[in-house]
């Protein structure tokens, strides 16, 4: 099991890996994740994460999805998954292709959330949801 201890410099360290995440960020597999409690549109969420030196989370493994679902408090969180309408394909914001399934698809739902269900859910990009930011652990 991971052992976390709070240091005085605003970072959370994991003794098992010697890696560091900022205060209030969660560590998983050499990455740091921030789950916001405030809500905003997808565009604002993207800018919010960018302002923290991170991106919206790219949840590209089942293990990462399970880890995040376990800590999402049954709320909807925007992630870095967007619909390429002309291509008719979902891609992560790093442009890698998404090979899974997105539920709740709708002509006007070009963004995606996780958290409330066990799946990736299509969502309106303009509605305000919480967001998950991701960056490398130091």
């Amino acid at each position: 099991p991971q052992i976390f201890n709070k240091s005085n410099d605003g970072f959370t360290t994991t003794r098992s890996y010697g890696t560091v995440c900022p205060k209030d960020w969660e560590f998983y597999q050499a990455r740091c994740f921030f789950l916001s409690t405030s809500e905003s549109s997808w565009n604002e969420s993207r800018d919010f994460c960018k302002g923290k030196g991170s991106t919206l989370a790219i949840v590209n493994t089942p293990e990462k999805l399970k880890f995040l679902q376990d800590i999402t408090d049954a709320e909807k969180y925007f992630i870095g998954l967007i619909y390429h309408r002309e291509e008719k394909r979902w891609r992560w914001i790093n442009n890698s292709v998404f090979n899974g399934n997105v539920t709740n698809q709708n002509q006007n739902f070009n963004c995606a959330t996780i958290g409330l269900t066990k799946t990736f859910d299509a969502a309106s990009c303009d509605i305000s949801y919480r967001r998950i930011c991701e960056k490398n652990a130091k």
């Epitope: 997808w42 993207r46 390429h84 309408r85 002309e86 891609r91 442009n95 890698s96 292709v97």
Partner: antibody, heavy 125, light 112 residues
Framework: QQQLEESGGGLVKPGGTLTLTCTAS?????????MCWVRQAPGKGLELIAC????????WYATWVNGRFTISRSTSLNTVDLKMTSLTAADTATYFC?????????????????WGPGTLVTVSS | DIVMTQTPASVEAGVGGTVTIKCQAS??????LAWYQQKAGQRPKLLIY???TLASGVPSRFKGSGSGTEYTLTISGVQPDDAATYYC??????????????FGGGTEVVVK
């Protein structure tokens, strides 16, 4: 049929300015596309210059551009322009217009699935 | 920036033979890779995207494979019409904020 056609190429003196135009037909700029300019010097490889998101006008430039080139678009005319200033012999190349799919809000892109035939720019005194 | 290293620069093949072109990325690009064919004096043509998906209308003798940092384009049963220069292109964006697509240096395929 979806097509791209470049125009505006030709001979220009060093230090001069030239504007290239890419005219798109068969699809609308109100959709989610990145429109880009790619160049190819004689006998050399492909080099990405700049891109613009068709619907919002959000732009991206290669780091080496250093403000010499400006990309813009007209949604009413379905055109993309590349204004090139302070041209040197090293800018001599065939300039291609290329289109990529884009994600919501222009926050994603992919491969180039549509290319124009290219227009030749020669910088020489 | 991610650097794409393409090898070899040139390769010769007989009709009916097999050509293998490699493209190496300076970091993991998660299969965000396309291959293009460019014949002399013509525009590039998309062959393969997402490392292995054949573009519409492209013959099945073209095959893309690979993952991580190593990618390969294989042309089986080479035809005279395959004489061209082939380019790989990365479109992975590790920052999620820019364009940053990079092309490999190209491989010239000469058909004997």
């Amino acid at each position: 049929q979806q097509q791209l056609e470049e125009s505006g190429g030709g001979l220009v003196k060093p230090g001069g300015t030239l504007t290239l135009t890419c005219t798109a037909s068969g699809f609308s700029f109100s959709s989610s596309y990145y429109m880009c300019w790619v160049r190819q010097a004689p006998g050399k490889g492909l080099e990405l210059i700049a891109c613009i998101y068709s619907s919002s006008g959000r732009t991206w430039y290669a780091t080496w551009v250093n403000g010499r080139f400006t990309i813009s678009r007209s949604t009413s005319l379905n055109t993309v322009d590349l204004k090139m200033t302070s041209l040197t012999a090293a800018d001599t190349a065939t300039y291609f217009c290329a289109r990529s799919y884009a994600g919501y809000g222009g926050y994603g892109y992919a491969y180039f699935n549509l290319w124009g035939p290219g227009t030749l720019v020669t910088v020489s005194s | 920036d991610i650097v794409m290293t393409q090898t070899p620069a040139s390769v010769e093949a007989g009709v009916g033979g097999t050509v293998t072109i490699k493209c190496q990325a300076s970091e993991d690009i998660y299969s965000s890779l396309a291959w293009y064919q460019q014949k002399a004096g013509q525009r590039p043509k998309l062959l393969i995207y997402d490392a292995s998906t054949l573009a519409s209308g492209v013959p099945s003798r073209f095959k893309g494979s690979g993952s991580g940092t190593e990618y390969t384009l294989t042309i089986s049963g080479v035809q005279p019409d395959d004489a061209a220069t082939y380019y790989c292109q990365n479109y992975y964006d590790s920052t999620g904020s820019g364009y940053g697509a990079a092309f490999g240096g190209g491989t010239e395929v000469v058909v004997k």
